[in-house]
């Protein structure tokens, strides 16, 4: 426990102290006091540096004194022979004796008392920044007017913090400016502007004088600006060393002025104002900004319009422009949106044609459509080349966005017909010689394919069966072959309105207008064994002359069989109508004069016994196109005859082209258009 006073006596005092002794005393007086230690008696064996026996006085780590020998008072009025004054409240006294004493020594007697210390003057380090006040057992610090004592109870500073500036313009100065600023102070000023405005600080060099930096370059007094995670400064010295205009890019700024105890100067003065937050003029590729300005600030709105061929894609929606607003944080809204090249996407496929997979489907890319040659050609022109246009469509120079249409090539057999042995009088043929040949199984007859959806035949073939089963693509009509070929399903049968329907068709003598069209449910796929025949043109070039040659084909009656298994064909000439009239009807069902002959009929045959016969009805009489020798057109349809192996009568197709075209147009489907 600390005590105010005390006595310390050497061992056995006042008798002689023993040899080989080491004893220590720890003196402690209350905090705020020093210790006055004085000796009234001292009789210790003398030695150099008190090496043998001694009394040692230690304060902290410092030896205050080491005593030996005999002392007596110099003052007759005072018993004190030696004394020590320490400004600390702790002291240690250590007594040591060696192994022998030549004489008898009585040791020492000492006393200590607590003494007041003057903290304000007794120490090298002044405890108070301004005023120090001593009292018995302690001290306190005090401050001049307008200063306040900090929590450490030692330092004084000015009350210069806590100011918040919210006006868009203002002036801030150090305390007492232009008089010297207070020492030992930390001044914090806050500028808080509305979001969207940045604090801009303006200083003049001459309005700044702050204690200069030390030799290491560290500011002793400093001015610092903090804006979010950005810091400007610290600044110090004579004349402002930083930029005279500080754009903080923030609506919040903290100004911190820190001073130490020495070297006060006049300080500083600054102005600030709020600038609308600028947004950078960003380089957005492939676009135009409207309005165009040198500088954009908070609340400015721009319309960013993509150049032709570019679009902004947000989710699944493509647009050509978007709006962006300069936001309070100095960033543009919608900054993620970009003008990307328009993507026309995978080009649509077309029926009976193809488009190569494009390397790119972006703006400017080029694709080419082709038709499945040689069976289809591009009907609507344009060359099939399309480019990806700015509107996101594949566009052709001629057709625009309309897709090309691949339509069947007509009248071109894959293999030309060559007459072999005479068979009534015909030759074996292959379906590739007559790819337009259609087989009707009930009644056994023929027809001609004229496009993907239509079959041309004789009216008498379909008058008794409005749902005929037809086949294309097979040379043989053996069942196993037909099972492998293409079966055609009718949707509707259109018989020419001029064809007279009879109660008893077997007794017919009038075959005028013997023509019908069958509309198919599904389009026919063309190929080497299935391909349409052309229709005649309406010009006089397509008027047949006597002797003009035509080809007939079918599975009708031959000399050997009632029905042919494999396709037969013959080449025969056009003959005058009278030649057909002159032939006697083989099995007349009426008077010979009753048979009707009209200009709607073509007479052909009579040469080498080549003729069509029962079962060939409806098949085409195919003639070489006068304007394109590579093609055949259906000049006639096998209709009737007086006698197989002589002359036969064929419906003159040229007379019905208008009816055919009208019927097809009126009964087409959207798919076909």
């Amino acid at each position: 426990e600390p005590t105010m006073y005390g006595e310390i006596l050497s061992p056995n005092y006042p008798q002689a102290y023993p040899s080989e002794v080491e004893k220590s005393w720890d003196i402690e007086v209350p905090e705020g006091y020093g210790i006055h230690l004085y000796f009234t008696h001292l009789d210790i064996e003398l030695s150099e540096n008190c090496a043998y026996d001694s009394v040692q006085i230690i304060s902290g780590d410092t030896e205050e004194g080491r005593l030996c020998g005999q002392r007596s008072s110099n003052n007759p009025h005072s018993p004190i022979v030696e004394e020590f004054q320490v400004p600390y409240n702790k002291l240690q006294v250590i007594f040591k004796s060696d192994f022998s004493n030549e004489e008898r020594f009585t040791g020492f007697a000492a006393y200590y008392v607590a003494t007041d210390i003057n903290e304000c003057t007794d120490f090298v380090d002044v405890p108070c920044s301004h005023f120090c006040n001593n009292f018995i057992g302690g001290y306190f610090c005090s401050c001049p007017p307008e200063y306040f004592l900090h929590d450490d109870m030692k330092n004084c500073g000015v009350n210069c913090s806590g100011d918040v500036f919210t006006a868009l313009i203002g002036e801030i100065a150090s305390p007492n400016y232009p008089k010297p600023y207070p020492e030992n102070s930390r001044c914090e000023y806050q500028i808080r502007l509305e979001k969207g405005f940045q604090v801009v600080v303006t200083l003049r060099r001459e309005d700044f004088d702050v204690e200069a930096a030390d030799s290491a370059g560290n500011c002793l007094d400093s001015l610092v600006f903090v804006a979010g995670d950005r810091q400007f400064g610290p600044y110090c010295g004579h004349g402002f060393p930083g930029p005279l205009n500080i754009e903080t890019k923030s609506n919040a700024l903290d100004i911190i002025f820190q001073t130490d105890l020495t070297g006060q100067k006049k300080g500083w003065k600054l102005r600030y104002h709020g600038d609308p937050m600028p947004c950078p003029k960003e380089d957005t590729p492939n676009s135009v900004w409207e309005p165009a300005k040198a500088k954009y600030v908070f609340r400015d709105v721009v319309q960013i319009t993509c150049l032709d061929g570019f679009e902004v894609v947000e989710g699944r929606v493509g647009a050509t422009s978007f709006y962006s607003t300069c936001q309070s944080n100095g960033k543009w809204s919608n900054s993620k949106l970009k003008c990307q090249p328009v993507d026309c996407g995978i080009p649509e496929s077309i029926e009976n044609g193809k488009v190569e997979d494009p390397e790119s489907t972006l703006f400017g890319s080029v694709i080419r459509y082709t038709c499945e040659e040689p069976y289809y050609y591009m009907e609507n022109g344009g060359g099939g080349e399309y480019h990806c246009a700015g509107n996101g469509s594949w566009v052709n120079e001629v057709l625009g966005p309309e897709l090309p249409k691949c339509v069947p090539v007509c009248g071109v057999p894959r293999e030309p017909f060559e007459e072999k042995q005479r068979i009534i009088g015909g030759s074996d043929a292959d379906i590739k010689n007559f790819p337009w040949q259609v087989f009707f199984d009930n009644p056994w007859a023929g027809g001609a394919l004229i496009n993907e959806y239509w079959v041309l035949t004789a009216a008498h073939v379909v008058e008794g069966n409005r749902e005929p089963t037809m086949y294309v693509g097979s040379t043989s009509v053996q069942t196993s072959r037909l099972a492998k070929s293409k079966m055609l399903t009718p949707e509707h049968v259109f018989i020419h309105p001029g064809w007279k329907l009879l109660e008893v068709p077997e007794g017919r003598t009038n075959f005028d207008n013997d023509i019908a069209l069958v509309r198919l449910k599904d389009p026919v796929k063309m190929g080497p064994t299935v391909s349409p025949i052309c229709l005649p043109g309406t010009s006089s070039d397509y008027n047949l002359m006597d002797g003009d040659l035509g080809l007939i084909s079918g599975w009708g009656r031959t000399e050997k069989r009632d029905r042919a298994v494999r396709l037969k064909a013959a080449r025969l000439p056009v003959a005058p109508l009278r030649k057909c009239k002159e032939v006697k009807v083989e099995k007349p069902t009426a008077d010979a004069e009753a048979y009707v002959f009209t200009p709607n009929m073509i007479c052909a045959g009579g040469e080498k016994g080549m003729d069509s016969c029962k079962g060939d009805s409806g098949g085409a009489f195919a003639v070489q196109d006068p304007n394109d020798k590579t093609k055949f057109y259906a000049a006639g349809l096998v209709s009737w005859g007086p006698q197989c192996g002589t002359y036969g009568l064929y419906t003159r197709v040229k007379n019905y082209v208008d009816w055919i075209m009208k019927t097809m147009q009126e009964n087409s489907t959207p798919r076909e258009d």
């Epitope: 199984d441 069942t479 196993s480």
Partner: antibody
Framework: EVQLVQSGAEVKKPGASVKVSCKVS????????MHWVRQAPGKGLEWMGT????????IYAQKFQGRVTMTEDTSTDTAYMELSSLRSEDTAVYYC????????????WGQGTLVTVSS | DIQMTQSPSTLSASVGDRVTITCRAS??????LAWYQQKPGKAPKLLIY???SLESGVPSRFSGSGSGTEFTLTISSLQPDDFATYYC?????????FGQGTKVEIK
């Protein structure tokens, strides 16, 4: 009118071969496609194969592949079916049949030839 | 090869009965199906071809229906001459196959 006349009944030992003929009258073999069908006693009909004149190849049922040979002699309008490595289960009536036209499977059947395989 | 499954294998019926025999193909055969009637010791006789077409000379009491994989032969009113074995046959592929047969016997 097409008619098919088949060769007479045969009795064969297991392991032997049999050749059944089928003569066409009223038409030429070149215009026809001949099929062969057999029927074991009390059992169902079993298609064996055919010559396809369009492709010029003979098609056999998997079951008979390697054991059956179908040939034609167009000069005599006769079709032949030879079955080798006979076993008792080959005992059956063997029919030649002409393929039909325009969706009819078979037109004319021969009268059948009974082949008996017995040791 | 295409398998043909006929049912029932045996059918007992009386004169005047309506009889139905079904045939199922293991894959689609479109309408390429025929029905035959066979009497003991005779070659089969074609009744129906292309699933529903009646062969000429065959009584109209016989009818066929179906397409794809399911087919039916119907005898609207069974006659004494109709007791026989009936076979279905597919000819969609060159490798023709028959059903195992349905024997129609007197009840």
């Amino acid at each position: 009118e097409v008619q098919l006349v088949q060769s007479g009944a045969e009795v064969k030992k297991p392991g032997a071969s049999v050749k059944v003929s089928c003569k066409v009258s009223g038409d030429t073999l070149t215009e026809l496609s001949m099929h062969w069908v057999r029927q074991a006693p009390g059992k169902g009909l079993e298609w064996m194969g055919t010559f396809d004149p369009e492709e010029g190849e003979t098609i056999y049922a998997q079951k008979f592949q390697g054991r059956v040979t179908m040939t034609e002699d167009t000069s005599t309008d006769t079709a032949y079916m030879e079955l080798s490595s006979l076993r008792s289960e080959d005992t059956a009536v063997y029919y030649c049949v002409t393929e039909g036209l325009a969706g009819r499977p078979y037109d004319v059947w021969g009268q059948g030839t009974l082949v008996t395989v017995s040791s | 090869d295409i398998q043909m499954t006929q049912s029932p294998s045996t059918l007992s019926a009386s004169v005047g009965d309506r009889v139905t025999i079904t045939c199922r193909a293991s894959q689609s055969i479109s309408s390429w199906l025929a029905w035959y009637q066979q009497k003991p010791g005779k070659a089969p006789k074609l009744l129906i071809y292309k699933a529903s077409s009646l062969e000429s000379g065959v009584p109209s009491r016989f009818s066929g229906s179906g397409s794809g994989t399911e087919f039916t032969l119907t005898i609207s009113s069974l006659q004494p001459d109709d007791f026989a074995t009936y076979y279905c046959q597919q000819y969609n592929s060159y490798k023709l196959t028959f059903g195992q047969g349905t024997k129609v016997e007197i009840k």
